[in-house]
Every structure is written in C-alpha cells, then in structure tokens.
C-alpha cells in the first residue's frame, strides 16, 4: 500500500471527510479526470488539482496533528506527479506564487504575452503540429 | 500575423509594458517554458500560465478600451490550448474556481484525495507506465 | 432576438463557383463562431465549415477542404461560403448556424440558432 | 473514423419511452459535448438537448440526454411519447481537431 493512503485516511478523519454525505453534489476532481484519457489533457487538469492541493495543505502547515500526514502526501505527489524532479517542482511552485494583483508581475505578464502564445499549441516549436491544431487564416 | 499579436501590442501601451525595464529581474513565465520540452511537463506549466492570464483578464473585464483585445486573446488563447473544445474549457474553469477556503470544498478534496493520487502518475491507470515512472517500495 | 438568414442558393452548373452569404442580428457577430452546415435532399445533416469570431481561423471537412473558402465581415454581421468546383453531390440545403462565444466560458449552447437555409442546385 | 453511430429508426406507441443511442467509433464520448437535434419533416433542426445533457428553455422534461462511458456512447431518451415527438434525430459532437460531426439520424414514428 502506498504510503499517501494511511495519512489521507488520517486527513479524513481530521476534516471529518469519510461520511458519505461529502459526496454529494457531485465530486470535484474525480468526475472531471474521468472525461479525459489523453496525456497532455490530464496534465492541464491535474496540475490545476494538484496547486489546489498544495495551497489546502499550505493553510494547515501550523496544525501540528496533521503535520506528518501532510508532509508525507507533498512528498509523494513530487514523486508521482513532478517524477521527483525539484526543478520542475519549483518551476511550477513560481508559477502558482505569482500575484495578479501585483503591477509588476501584470507588467511582465503583458510583456511575455506573445511568445506564451505562440507556444500554446502542441508542438508549434517543432512545426510537428498534429492535425487538430490546424489553423486557417484568411 | 496571428490576431492576437495586434490585441497584445494594444495591452502592452495600455499596461505600459513596452518598456525594456520591464524584462528586469527575470521573465515570469518565458524562462520556465524554456525548461521544459515534453508535452506533457509543458502542459503542466502552461496550465498555470493560461489560468493566470484568465484572472488577470478577469480583473480587467469592464475596462471598455481593452474589452475587444481581451476577447480576442482569450478566443485565441481557447483555439490554442483548449483546441476550442468547450468541454476541456468549462472543466478547467471548473477547477480553477474552487475555493480552498470553503469547508465543503475541502472536506471533497480530502475526500477526493486517495483517488486522485492514485491517478497522479502517468499511464498509472493503464498499466503502461513508462521507466520514470516505476516506483519501488520495501 | 437571435436571427441568421442565409442567401445566395441557386442553380448553377457543375464545375462552376457560388458564393452564398448568411446575415445575423439580434447578438454581438464579432464574439461568436459561425458553422456552415449541409442537408442534402433526403439525407443527414453534414459538417462544412466553421470561421472563429474576432481571431477568424477557418476549420473545413476534410471531404471538402480546397474547394470551399468561409471568410466573415464583423463590421457588417455577415459571413460568406465560397464554393469552387462544384458537383451534384454538393446539392443541398446550405445552413447558416451560431457557434459558441469562445471569449466567454459562459456562452449559450454550439448550434443553438439556426437559419432557414439557401438551396444550392448543381446540374447540368 | 470519428463516426457517431445510430439507429436508422425507432417506432413506439404514444405514452411510452423511447432511447436512442449515439455510439462514438474513435475517441472518448466524455471528452467533447454532445448535442441531440430534432428535426420535423421541412423543418430546420431544433437543440433539444445540449452538453450532454442539458436542455434548452422551451424543451419538456419528458426529453433527457446521457452519456455512458462503458459503452463510449450518448442517449436521447423521450418519455411519454407524444404524435408531435414524430422527427428525425441527430446526435451531434466533435472530432479530434474539434470539428462538428454529426450522427445519421434516427427517424422515430410514434404508433397509431
């Protein structure tokens, strides 16, 4: 058994999570990961899912009944969704960090607007476009 | 050209991002996307990117002047990296939306969250997982 | 209220171009996507084009790519089908159809509003 | 291909239900909208359903959409079968490069 699943089960009982009644209304993530097998989708999904995991986690870093089962979930999501990669944990850490409030970072964000788009489309480096991607313009 | 570089030219004098000045200290996002050439790492980045330039047009919704070069950039921002499919629009939305701070958004997520990580890693579903992804535990 | 007329339809040779217009009112034009779609006499509805609002990129059937152009005119709510080539199996009701408002997550449903189409006859 | 697969035709008495199934030949069902189209002999296709299983204003409860991943289709289910239901029926989606597809059509007759 992977070692996240003791200390959700933990979690649970702290948010008083196990009751069936969470359930309803309709899950969060889980029907959402379900409409999407692709790859590439599931990363824009879950990368949504997993910065909201680490902000949850961030506002109960001081509760000291939690701390271990939280330090151990973080632990196991770099491993399994950032491959245990620091770089690209930080990079992505950056990237949920930024203000958009900040004037600054506004500035930088407009400034940087036009070469974000022209890679936003897979493969639009490598000119490997697939056949969705395919764009017409008169 | 793409439509959307005449709408960004418009919100860089608008923000007055033009400027050399502004490219100090660092880029927010053009260094981080340097990093990563896998589509699916790039998705993880970009999905970050994308939600934030969706917050900070947000923000600016009502100012009238820049109303038509946002809607023309988030159009093509939809076209792009949604491939105008509305279903993986609405789903990212969706995410992006929630509040960690609600009670019953919190108690789902923890609810959530053993599902969630089983999904985590690439292929984990379909058994196809690639080396990096194979994972030995005592 | 929401109106999409289509004109241009008529008979004409095979081999020879038409091109056919579709006018709306009634919604901000320049926001939405606007889908071309067919019916021949008898048969089911078929895909042919679709033109993006603001950023106006193209998509066509694979089937037809080539011969048929769509291009828009926001400043005068209109969009246009150029059809070249023209052959019998091209006979069909012509519909103009409103597509989604890409620029706003909560646009009202794809294909919602259609017009009442143009008749496009290719005979000799 | 990316064909979307119906019945040619469907026929039942007024009061009951009918389903009609929208099987999808490449690709995941739940990875793009569907929409269910009702078209009256002459007429022009009408929403009846939308996004799987909305319904716009003006469409009676009686009519509802779904979608089953086991069997990677959609369904348009009407209830309460009334003469007036009588029409031709499209399922409607997407393909890869999310270009509109369109299922043959179901014509359903409402007995006697």
């Known amino acids: 058994q992977d070692p996240y699943v003791k200390e959700a089960e933990n979690l649970k009982k702290y948010f008083n999570a196990g009751h069936s009644d969470v359930a309803d209304n309709g899950t969060l993530f889980l029907g959402i990961l379900k409409n999407w097998k692709e790859e590439s989708d599931r990363k824009i999904m879950q990368s949504q899912i997993v910065s909201f995991y680490f902000k949850l986690f961030k506002n109960f870093k001081d509760d000291q009944s939690i701390q271990k089962s939280v330090e151990t979930i973080k632990e196991d999501m770099n491993v399994k969704f950032f491959n245990s990669n620091k770089k690209k944990r930080d990079d992505f850490e950056k990237l949920t960090n930024y203000s958009v409030t900040d004037l600054n970072v506004q500035r930088k964000a407009i400034h940087e607007l036009i070469q974000v788009m022209a890679e936003l489309s897979p493969a639009a480096k490598t000119g490997k476009r697939k056949r969705s991607q395919m764009l017409f313009r008169g | 050209q793409d439509p959307y570089v005449k709408e960004a030219e418009n919100l860089k004098k608008y923000f007055n991002a033009g400027h050399s000045d502004v490219a100090d200290n660092g880029t927010l996002f053009l260094g981080i996307l340097k990093n990563w050439k896998e589509e699916s790492d790039r998705k993880i980045m970009q999905s970050q990117i994308v939600s934030f330039y969706f917050k900070l047009f947000k923000n600016f919704k009502d100012d009238q002047s820049i109303q038509k070069s946002v809607e023309t950039i988030k159009e093509d921002m939809n076209v792009k990296f949604f491939n105008s499919n509305k279903k993986k629009r609405d789903d990212f939305e969706k995410l992006t939306n929630y509040s960690v701070t609600d009670l019953n958004v919190q108690r789902k997520a923890i609810h959530e969250l053993i599902q969630v990580m089983a999904e985590l890693s690439p292929a984990a579903k379909t058994g196809k997982r690639k080396r990096s992804q194979m994972l030995f535990r005592g | 209220e929401v109106q999409l007329v289509e004109s241009g339809g008529g008979l004409v040779k095979p081999g020879d171009s038409l091109t056919v217009s579709c006018v709306a009112s009634g919604f901000t034009f320049s926001n939405y996507f606007i889908h071309w779609v067919r019916q021949a006499p008898g048969k089911g509805l078929e895909w042919v084009a679709t033109i993006s609002g603001r950023t106006k990129y193209m998509f066509y059937s694979d089937s037809l790519r080539g011969r048929f152009t769509v291009s828009r005119d926001n400043a005068n709510n209109s969009v246009y089908l150029h059809m070249s080539s023209l052959r019998g199996e091209d006979t069909a009701l012509y519909y103009c159809?409103?597509?989604?408002?890409?620029?706003?997550?909560?646009?009202?449903?794809?294909?919602?509003?259609w017009g009442r189409g143009t008749l496009v006859t290719v005979s000799s | 291909n990316f064909m979307l697969t119906q019945p040619h035709s469907v026929s039942e008495s007024p009061g009951k239900t009918i389903t009609i199934s929208c099987t999808r030949g490449?690709?995941?069902?739940?990875?793009?909208?569907v929409q269910w189209y009702q078209q009256r002999p002459g007429g022009v296709p009408k929403i009846v359903v939308f996004?799987?299983?909305?319904?716009p204003s003006g469409v009676p409860d009686r009519i509802s959409g779904s979608i089953d991943t086991s069997t990677n289709s959609a369904s348009l289910t009407i209830s309460g079968l009334q003469t007036e239901d009588e029409a031709d029926y499209y399922c409607?989606?997407?393909?890869?490069?999310?270009?509109?597809?369109f299922g043959g059509g179901t014509k359903l007759t409402v007995l006697g």
């Open positions: 490449r690709g995941y069902i739940a990875s793009y909208y």
């Open positions: 409607q989606s997407y393909d890869d490069a999310n270009h509109v597809i």
């Open positions: 996004e799987d299983t909305q319904r």
């Open positions: 159809v409103r597509g989604y408002d890409h620029s706003d997550s909560n646009s009202a449903a794809d294909l919602l509003h």
